[in-house]
């Protein structure tokens, strides 16, 4: 059974992940971002279901494409280089989902824009945090 300290750690990691995803979304939605229209043409893949930490596998698998799209955006829209930002997110995701079980992600048929993709994972983090508090 999860201990209160492990629950607290999970909560902190989810809050960190949430802040990173919100920072990316804010950087993209920045009215000074001339790349928004271009970035919105890139297709992202969403999980069919995202209700548990193991479903973060679906986020992990889309981190490389996310980095590629962020490489297009002016770096001044973000505090960190896309590579460092995605690397940080990857570390948190790996810790949260755990490496013991191998989960095969199932993707929805419809693709999403980067904004929809980020909003989906932001909602996921908020939802899991609310169950922990």
């Amino acid at each position: 059974a999860p201990t209160s300290s492990s629950t607290k750690k999970t909560q902190l990691q989810l809050e960190h992940l949430l802040l990173d995803l919100q920072m990316i979304l804010n950087g993209i939605n920045n009215y000074k971002n001339p790349k928004l229209t271009r970035m919105l043409t890139f297709k992202f893949y969403m999980p069919k279901k995202a209700t548990e930490l193991k479903h973060l596998q679906c986020l992990e698998e889309e981190l490389k494409p996310l980095e590629e799209v962020l490489n297009l955006a002016q770096s001044k829209n973000f505090h960190l280089r896309p590579r460092d930002l995605i690397s940080n997110i990857n570390v948190i995701v790996l810790e949260l989902k755990g490496s013991e079980t191998t989960f095969m992600c199932e993707y929805a048929d419809e693709t999403a824009t980067i904004v929809e993709f980020l909003n989906r994972w932001i909602t996921f983090c908020q939802s899991i945090i609310s169950t922990l508090t």
Epitope: T41, K43, F44, E62, K64, P65, E68, C105
Partner: antibody, heavy 121, light 113 residues
């Protein structure tokens, strides 16, 4: 028809610089990134970098960071690459290229005919 | 950067033969979301610009003869040319365009025996 027309061959002395052009036709240059690729027969193909003509933003491969400068002029629908501090190793054919689709996850499908740059004293 | 290891360096063939060129990437080029491999194959003849033959590892570019077949997934890819013609003699390169910077294989020279 989509075409990328490059400037003619150049002969330069070591230490000098050269500016190559790539004029696009059949589409609006601001709709796609323009990539530059170097070809040396003994080294194959190497990606130099890209420019987004819409806002002039650039990305370079690390080894070309201080060698190449990419620019674009939307009024003439053209992209340019300046190569500085030329050495005999810079002798190569330089290509501009555009992807198959503007969604970024497609490879280079449209290429200029190439510009041969020869650096010799 | 992703390293693309292409083999063989050169290949001597007779017309009508079948040839295979291999390309190995140092990281997987498969995107799980769409099950596509971000690998392309190019043909370059002397004095000409590279020509896109195959993209997404196995999708033939419009107008390319169907004797050019791309296959493979993840880190191992193959370009097969069945029934080689004299006009196929050229250099062939693989390119990964999954992760920046895009990187090419060293090339394979296809020559006549």
């Amino acid at each position: 028809e989509i075409q990328l027309q490059q400037s003619g061959p150049e002969l330069r002395r070591p230490g000098s610089s050269v500016k190559l052009s790539c004029k696009a036709s059949g589409y609006n240059i601001t709709d796609y990134l323009i990539h530059w690729v170097r070809h040396r027969p003994e080294h194959g193909l190497e990606w130099i970098g890209w420019i987004d003509p819409e806002d002039g933003e650039t990305r370079y491969a690390q080894k070309f960071q201080s060698k190449a400068t990419l620019t674009a002029d939307t009024s003439s629908n053209a992209a340019y690459m300046q190569l500085s501090s030329l050495t005999p190793e810079d002798t190569a054919t330089y290509f501009c290229a555009r992807s198959l689709d503007s969604t970024y996850d497609y490879p280079f499908a449209y290429w200029g005919q190439g510009t041969l740059v020869t650096v010799s004293s | 950067d992703i390293v693309m290891t292409q083999s063989p360096f050169s290949l001597a063939v007779s017309e009508g033969e079948m040839v295979t060129i291999n390309c190995k990437s140092s990281q997987s080029l498969l995107r799980s979301g769409n099950q596509k491999n971000y690998l392309a194959w190019y043909q370059q003849k002397p004095g000409q610009s590279p020509k896109l033959l195959i993209y997404y590892a196995s999708t033939g570019q419009s107008g390319v003869p169907d004797r050019f077949i791309g296959s493979g997934s993840g880190t191992d890819f193959t370009l097969t040319i069945s029934d080689v013609q004299a006009e196929d003699l050229a250099d062939y390169y693989c390119l990964q365009h999954y992760i920046s910077p895009p990187t090419f294989g060293a090339g394979t020279k296809l020559e006549l025996k």
